[in-house]
């Protein structure tokens, strides 16, 4: 279930897990279904807050991903301590009206009090029924 991602910060992310997805194989996001994501990262700062930002490029058009709870402290225990590893588990209910696409790039960024905590880009996602 471990998937390959491109780091877009300073290699804070240790691993990303998505049930049913493997390595660099296409990862299917099903419309109207829950999409589970787990990420392990090492905090690069002490922070009281952790805010998640998810953007998707669908056929080259960048969009904010709807229906996201931005407070990462709802799904991991805050505050975060620099140097410690944390496990984020999040389930996103994919909208039924999400556009179908074979070319989806997802960028997940976690922001702390002093800037980027972690950042990953998944380049092999697809949105299907």
């Amino acid at each position: 279930d471990q998937v390959d991602v491109k780091d877009c910060a300073n290699h804070e992310i240790k691993k990303v897990l998505v049930p049913g997805c493997h390595g660099s194989e296409p990862c299917i996001i099903h419309r109207g279904k829950p999409f589970q994501l787990e990420a392990v990262f090492e905090a690069n700062q002490n922070t009281k807050t952790a805010k998640i930002e998810i953007k998707a490029s669908i056929d080259g058009l960048e969009v904010d991903v709807p229906g996201i709870d931005p407070n990462a402290c709802h799904y991991m225990k805050c505050p975060l301590v620099k140097g410690q590893q944390y496990d984020i588990k999040y389930t996103w209910n994919v909208p039924k009206i999400a556009p179908k696409s074979e070319n989806v790039v997802v960028t997940v960024k976690v922001m702390g009090d002093d800037g980027v905590l972690a950042c990953a880009i998944a380049t092999h996602a697809k949105i299907r029924d």
């Epitope: 229906g67 996201i68 407070n71 799904y75 225990k77």
Partner: antibody, heavy 118, light 106 residues
Framework: EVQLVESGGGLIQPGGSLRLSCAGS????????MAWVRQAPGKGLEWVST???????FYADSVKGRFTISGDNSKNTLYLQMGSLRAEDTAVYYC????????????WGQGTMVTVSS | SYELTQPLSVSVALGQTARITCGGN??????VHWYQQKPGLAPVLVIY???NRPSGIPARFSGSSSGNTATLTISSAQAGDEADYYC?????????FGGGTKLTVL
């Protein structure tokens, strides 16, 4: 002073609709994480809905498809549009602000009573 | 769905220590918050993130959490502490409250 004031409660027949308002002062409602929480007479607290500054909304299963949470930046007000009301929706409805440095509701309104009865 | 279990009532003698528990599966891995509610009034946050007190809350109020139990402790209980107390956690994007505990100060 930072505070929230609810209004819009009242007596409504089953199947009817009602819109609750929550006016904020001392902070901007629409740039904060905001929630509605209700309390049936003699019962405990029950979460109803949450809205985040980016516009994402979440609902308890008991109200999903019937209630809609929203905010108006110009009025600095949070709303709860309630439809297809049932007797079990009878409760005091509170709006509350979530402090993101605490993940807890640090500011609450005084509550507004909604009674669903024929 | 995630559930939190609290005792319906707890009694404490004036000036003694009251402990109110909140049980949940692996609750120690979550941030636990506590609210005090007096009759006819809105809830008031008394402890956030397991053990932190908001400004204005007396030092008599403290909290802890580990394993499957979180505990709100009120030392040297006063008559004014008589109220309902609720624990709260986030289960991903869902707010979960405990059923509430009525604290009686004898």
């Amino acid at each position: 002073e930072v505070q929230l004031v609810e209004s819009g409660g009242g007596l409504i027949q089953p199947g009817g609709s009602l819109r609750l308002s929550c006016a904020g002062s001392g902070f901007t409602v629409t740039t904060n994480y905001m929630a509605w929480v209700r309390q049936a007479p003699g019962k405990g607290l029950e979460w109803v809905s949450t809205i985040y500054s980016a516009g994402s909304t979440f609902y308890a299963d008991s109200v999903k498809g019937r209630f809609t949470i929203s905010g108006d930046n110009s009025k600095n007000t949070l709303y709860l549009q309630m439809g297809s009301l049932r007797a079990e929706d009878t409760a005091v409805y509170y709006c509350a602000r979530e402090n993101p440095a605490q993940d807890a509701f640090d500011i609450w309104g005084q509550g507004t009573m909604v009674t669903v009865s024929s | 769905s995630y559930e939190l279990t609290q005792p319906l009532s707890v009694s404490v003698a004036l000036g003694q220590t009251a402990r109110i528990t909140c049980g949940g599966n692996n609750i120690g891995s979550k941030n636990v918050h506590w609210y005090q509610q007096k009759p006819g009034l809105a809830p008031v946050l008394v402890i956030y993130r397991d053990s932190n007190r908001p400004s204005g809350i007396p030092a008599r109020f403290s909290g802890s959490s580990s394993g499957n139990t979180a505990t709100l402790t009120i030392s040297s209980a006063q008559a004014g502490d008589e109220a309902d107390y609720y624990c709260h956690v986030w289960d991903t994007s869902t707010v979960v409250f405990g059923g509430g505990t009525k604290l009686t100060v004898l």
